[in-house]
Interface confidence: low
């Protein structure tokens, strides 16, 4: 039994290491945001015994703008971004982040993810200037690959709703 994709949390991102039952994961407040005191970034894959269906617990996390980072202007989105060195998880955590109760998603992890159920529409909850979205889903079959080919999906923008597994992400550049 595995969990479906975790729910979305505004201005937070999640790279899930495992969808297995009892896995614990933490959301990361995006750059320029910090965890609001008294809220928790933790989510756990648990089993609903009545339905025998696994689901992620609802985090109480609220990510709020970090006044300490207001002076930092994000790089314009037109810049080409590359990196050969993987930053450590701590560099992703704005001040005010709670200590990890379980090992956080390491940037060095070979398989980390956030996901959305196949067939769901991709719906950013915010405009690109105010928030961004991370999505993916369980592998589905694809046609024969070619050297330069394309595959299409429908994507619907929505300002009011997003399906589980779509993760808004703040658009500032550094932590």
């Amino acid at each position: 039994i595995t969990c479906p994709p975790p729910m979305s949390v505004e201005h937070a991102d999640i790279w899930v290491k495992s969808y297995s039952l009892y896995s614990r994961e933490r959301y990361i407040c995006n750059s320029g945001f910090k965890r609001k005191a008294g809220t928790s970034s933790l989510t756990e894959c648990v089993l609903n015994k009545a339905t025998n269906v696994a689901h992620w617990t609802t985090p109480s996390l609220k990510c709020i703008r970090d006044p300490a980072l207001v002076h930092q202007r994000p790089a314009p989105p037109s810049t080409v971004t590359t990196a050969g060195v993987t930053p450590q998880p701590e560099s992703l955590s704005p001040s005010g982040k709670e200590p990890a109760a379980s090992s956080p998603s390491s940037n060095n992890t070979a398989a980390t993810t956030a996901a959305i159920v196949p067939g769901s529409q991709l719906m950013p909850s915010k405009s690109p200037s105010t928030g961004t979205t991370e999505i993916s889903s369980h592998e589905s079959s694809h046609g024969t690959p070619s050297q330069t080919t394309a595959k299409n999906w429908e994507l619907t923008a929505s300002a009011s709703h997003q399906p589980p597994g779509v993760y808004p992400q703040g658009h500032s550049d550094t932590t």
Epitope: L92, A114, T132, S136, Q169
Partner: nanobody, 119 residues
Framework: EVQLVESGGGLVQPGGSLRLSCAAS????????MSWVRQAPGKGLEWVSG????????RYADSVKGRFTIGRDNAKNTLYLQMNSLKPEDTGVYYC????????????RGQGTQVTVSS
């Protein structure tokens, strides 16, 4: 409609380099985490690298660390993968896709570009 078009694959000798590109359209590219995954002949899907919107969260599979570099140009709606010091085991179809990815948990993605590392 979301469209992802990979290019840049080809035949290269061991130790050589390739630069893959992924042209994205039909969605707000700059608003999404993007990743590269690959599938070796007869094997399952393997996550290679992912990059968030601002580029401050970049991740690599252990098998490619120090050799591959992921990048993105949000103005051009393009994702890149610079592959250096290529090995025969890097052979496979490389897919560009939306999202941060776990092995065998990935979609949507493009239909791929073939990379063959052989002498």
């Amino acid at each position: 409609e979301v469209q992802l078009v990979e290019s840049g694959g080809g035949l290269v000798q061991p130790g050589g380099s390739l630069r893959l590109s992924c042209a994205a359209s039909g969605f707000a590219f700059s608003s999404y985490v993007m990743s590269w995954v690959r599938q070796a002949p007869g094997k399952g899907l393997e996550w290679v690298s992912g990059i968030n919107t601002g580029g401050d969260d970049i991740r690599y599979a252990d098998s490619v660390k120090g050799r591959f570099t992921i990048g993105r140009d949000n103005a051009k709606n393009t994702l890149y993968l610079q592959m250096n010091s290529l090995k025969p085991e890097d052979t496979g179809v490389y897919y560009c896709g939306v999202g941060g990815v776990a092995v065998n948990a990935y979609d949507p993605r493009g239909q791929g570009t073939q990379v063959t590392v052989s002498s």
